[in-house]
Interface confidence: low
């Protein structure tokens, strides 16, 4: 049997303050438990929710917690079910609201002698005390006419008369806490002889030289005297008229007439009324001059066939505010339809290339009307002029493929190559009608091509293959200038391309033939062993059926490669002395050297005094700085080799002796002393 | 469960008199303002009347003179005393209570009980 | 005499659709949120849904929504399920000073498209 350990209790709660309704369950099986709250089963929220068994409440609501909880618990293998105990929560709340009138309707109602009831919006529970009070002093029950129903809220003043009139606000209070009226009840009741307003006047706007009229009227008993003012506090009478208001004329019924209206006349006009007793009223208008501003201009507007478009008009500034309307062709468009305008929107639906044109936005108002042309242009889809051909272009030459379409607006051509986009550089270049030109055609721009053609409306696209009519050439050219080292096997290279396969021979250039030990095996000059005969002019040709020849001229140098008879050591001198890197080079050409320190070359022309290369390619150094310690460079060159050797300097603070060491004591390491 | 049961309905002549009453169990319907509403076959919801807390009645302007609301606290109860019935009264008559003693909002409806009223 | 609007009087849609149905008083109500809505189907008792014009009642679907103050009001459905079909009642409270305490608008029946 399912049992209740803890049960929920009736208890009381504070409005959203924290409060738990306790449910504890023993059963021999599991159990599940829920809530129910008059009789619904309550869902969680963040602010009531299941903790446990109990049912936990962040935040108590008076209206959303009244009623009465249930706990349930139900085993769901045997279907047994335990309900607990009713509990509910005894709400203590209060809750500020206005002061409002209950009796009479509406305050147009309440008259001099009639019942005025008022009500104090405040609310609670326990119900709350209540005091009411006038201008802010507090009224007690059965004074003056007036007397208060606590229970009720009401505060009622039978009958009302003009010394009740004031701003009305109550305050409550109870054992939750208190609170006061939110917003107060001002009640006015008339005093015969104060000014009333039966007319009041109402802000105009006009045009420039138009006339404007201003009415206002009271009424009191004896009757009330009216006058009027401007800005400047002038009085306005039919008799004195301030000197920029001379067109201004004052009716025996209180209007004020002014003709002939000017920007000086603009601003505030002040109606007043006097009681033989009470405050005068005061009304004011304001004269308004019409003005309109222009119009900012519209951007050209492309939109697609089938679809449905807007164009806002925004209207210019002015007053009073300009109305607008479209036009188009001269006729102003309707309120419905497929075109038509709605509100300050031009709507186009179902857009037909009809529809293409001038449409134009007028506004007007008191001071005139403007007026801003929008051209609306209908996209449609290209069309071929002429689609890109499979073509032939030749190597090294402009190639040109066509892609020529038609629409409205001119269309966009993009390229392709190999589904790549092509972006204009040195080589690829659209032109304005579509066509792509490759300034110099090279043998890999055999491809796929594919232009694309596009308007707002849609878009069209072709492709063609471009196979490129190869020149018959050396790949690569032959250097013109070759060396061989005498002594030595050597092979120089040739070879060619076409849109055959050309046959490659070597020839000597005076036409006599080449000797026994060189051969010419498919393009490449074979030497078995260099000799100084070897020297000379060659020819190189590559031929072919329909592209005929092509020559390569070599000069081939016999030259003993360059090797180093001395090469300079790692050298360390003392500051201020000189150091000495030697090198020496031989070969055939006779070499020369260059310097390098520093990763910079040593200039022999433009050498300070301190450092000199000599004849036999040697570097001296005088009085050697530490900034000239680092890694030298010797590189000995000539037409047909090239060869370097490098060793470090070191630049040392020359010891002083100390006086156990004798003046021939060695240095600590091995110096070049001078 | 909290709910609200109306009886009293049924077949009576033009110009009877008949008396429904509003019967609470679950809640204490002292604490709440009941209201009486009503519904013609096939038509919409139409306020009759109510009584406050503090037994205040106020009447819609159609059933002033006619129409008289009341309460028993010790029997929790809620009555709508009917008079000079005519034949446009025929309706399901609902009593409902409010959200709580200061609104008048309706939270919680009874299930209705049909007044006939036809010769 | 207050009168309570409620259009569309009938409304048909479909399971999914998004349901707008708008109340106006012809009086502000007593306090700018004093409004509920109700739905009721043919033979029951109408079921409280919104009520302070925003709130949704314990145990609602949070399809069910309320905006609106003063005289204005709105009720949506988000997004209409099969047991949403029936008729819908807003319901305001007034100062009592003309007699009219109550009012109900004169109902929104919502019917399967």
């Known amino acids: 049997a399912i049992v209740f350990i803890k049960q929920p209790s009736s208890q009381d709660a504070l409005q959203g303050r924290r409060a738990l309704l306790r449910c504890e369950v023993e059963a021999p099986g599991p159990v599940h438990v829920y809530w129910l709250l008059d009789g619904a089963p309550v869902q969680d929220t963040e602010r009531r929710f299941a903790q446990g068994s109990s049912l936990s409440f962040a935040a108590v609501d008076r209206l959303q917690d009244s009623g009465t909880f249930q706990c349930v618990a139900r085993d769901d293998v045997t279907g047994e079910e335990a309900r607990s105990a009713n509990a509910s929560f005894n709400i203590k709340w209060i809750e500020a609201g206005p002061v409002v009138l209950k009796h009479p309707a509406s305050e147009a109602e309440i008259q001099p002698q009639t019942q005025v009831t008022l009500r104090c919006h405040i609310d609670g529970h326990p119900r709350p005390t209540y005091q009411w009070f006038r201008d802010g002093t507090p009224l007690s029950d059965g004074q003056s006419n007036h007397t208060v129903s606590s229970k009720e809220r009401n505060l009622t003043l039978r009958p009302a008369g003009p010394e009740h009139s004031g701003l009305y606000s109550c305050c409550a209070h109870s054992a939750f806490g208190q609170a006061c009226s939110s917003q107060n009840f001002t009640l006015s009741i008339a005093d015969e002889s104060f000014a009333r307003v039966v007319l009041a006047p109402q802000d105009v706007v006009v045009a420039r030289y138009e006339e404007a009229m201003f009415h206002c009227q009271f009424s009191a008993q004896p009757p009330p005297s009216l006058q009027w003012l401007f800005e400047d506090e002038t009085p306005i009478t039919n008799r004195s008229r301030p000197p920029h208001l001379r067109r201004a004329t004052v009716f025996a019924n209180g209007s004020l007439l002014l003709t002939q209206v000017r920007p000086r006349n603009a601003g505030i006009y002040r109606c007043i009324g006097q009681g033989q007793r009470g405050p005068p009223i005061i009304l004011e208008a304001t004269l308004h001059l019409a003005e309109i501003e222009d119009m900012p201009l519209f951007e050209p507007r492309v939109f697609t066939a089938g679809s449905e478009e807007r164009v806002t008009c925004l209207p210019p500034k002015g007053l009073p505010e300009p109305s607008v309307w479209w036009e188009h062709a001269g006729v102003r468009l309707p309120t419905h339809g497929r075109v038509y305008q709605k509100g300050h929107e031009l709507v186009l639906a179902n857009i037909a290339e009809s529809d293409a044109g001038v449409y134009t936005c007028h506004a007007a108002n008191l001071a005139g009307q403007r007026r801003q042309d929008v051209n609306i242009t209908v996209a449609t889809v290209p069309s071929w002029l002429k689609k890109p051909q499979d073509s032939q272009l030749e190597e090294g030459k402009p190639g040109y493929l066509d892609c020529l379409t038609q629409a409205t607006p001119k269309p966009t051509v993009v390229w392709y190559r190999n589904q790549m986009l092509i972006s204009e550089d040195s080589r690829f270049e659209v032109f304005k009608n579509g066509t792509l030109r490759i300034n110099s055609v090279e043998v890999y721009d055999g491809t796929w091509y594919r232009c694309m053609s596009s308007t707002p409306a849609g878009s069209i696209e072709a492709q063609a293959r471009v196979q490129v009519l190869e020149k018959l050439k050396f790949t690569p050219p032959p250097q013109p200038q070759q060396c061989m080292e005498f002594d030595k096997e050597a092979t120089v290279p040739c070879s060619a391309t076409g849109r055959e396969k050309p046959t490659i021979k070597w020839e000597r250039a005076d036409g006599s033939s080449l000797p026994e030990w060189v051969t010419d095996n498919a393009g490449t000059l074979h030497f078995a062993r260099v000799t100084r005969d070897d020297a000379g002019n060659y020819t190189c040709i590559a031929s072919n059926g329909p592209q005929g020849q092509i020559r390569a001229h070599v000069q081939l140098t016999v030259a003993v490669f360059i090797t180093f008879k001395v090469e300079p050591e790692r050298t360390t001198v003392y500051q201020g002395h000189t150091a000495l890197l030697q090198c020496e080079a031989q070969g055939d050409p006779k070499p020369l050297i260059q310097w390098k320190g520093k990763d910079r070359i040593l200039d022999p022309t433009k050498l300070g005094p301190r450092m000199h290369i000599f004849q036999n390619g040697s570097l001296v150094i005088h009085d050697v700085a530490p900034e000239d310690s680092g890694r030298y460079t010797c590189i000995a060159g000539n037409s047909c080799n090239i060869k370097h050797t490098e060793a470090p300097l070191y630049v040392v603070d020359k010891p002083v002796p100390e006086e156990s060491e004798g003046p021939g004591s060695p240095p600590p390491y091995k110096m070049i002393q001078t | 469960e909290v709910q609200l049961v109306e009886s009293g309905g049924g077949l009576v002549q033009p110009g009877g008199s008949l008396r429904l009453s509003c019967t609470a169990s679950?809640?204490?319907?002292?604490?709440?303002?009941v209201i009486w509403v009503r519904q013609a076959p096939g038509k919409g919801l139409e306020w009759v009347g109510i009584i406050y807390t503090y037994d205040t009645t106020y009447y819609a302007n159609w059933a002033k003179g006619r129409f008289t609301i009341s309460r028993d606290t010790s029997k929790n109860t809620v009555y709508l005393q009917m008079n000079s019935l005519r034949a446009e009264d025929t309706a399901v008559y609902f009593c409902?209570?409010?959200?709580?003693?200061?609104?008048?909002?309706?939270?919680?409806w009874g299930q209705g009980t049909l007044v006939t009223v036809s010769s | 005499e207050i009168v309570m609007t409620q259009s569309p009087s009938t409304l048909s849609a479909s399971v999914g659709d998004r349901v707008i149905i708008t109340c106006q008083a012809s009086?502000?109500?007593?306090?700018?949120?004093?409004l509920a809505w109700y739905q009721q189907k043919p033979g029951k008792a109408p079921k409280l849904l919104i009520y302070e014009a925003s709130k949704l009642a314990s145990g609602v679907p949070s399809r069910f929504s309320g905006s609106g103050s003063g005289a204005e009001f709105t009720l949506t459905i988000s997004s209409l399920q099969p047991d949403d079909f029936a008729t819908y009642y807003c319901?305001?409270?007034?100062?009592?000073?003309?007699?009219?305490?109550?009012?109900f608008g004169q109902g929104t029946k919502l019917t399967v498209l």
């Open positions: 409902a209570r409010s959200f709580s003693d200061i609104s008048d909002l309706i939270k919680l």
């Open positions: 679950g809640i204490d319907l002292s604490n709440y303002a």
């Open positions: 009086q502000s109500l007593y306090n700018n949120k004093d």
């Open positions: 319901h305001g409270e007034f100062s009592c000073g003309s007699g009219d305490c109550l009012a």
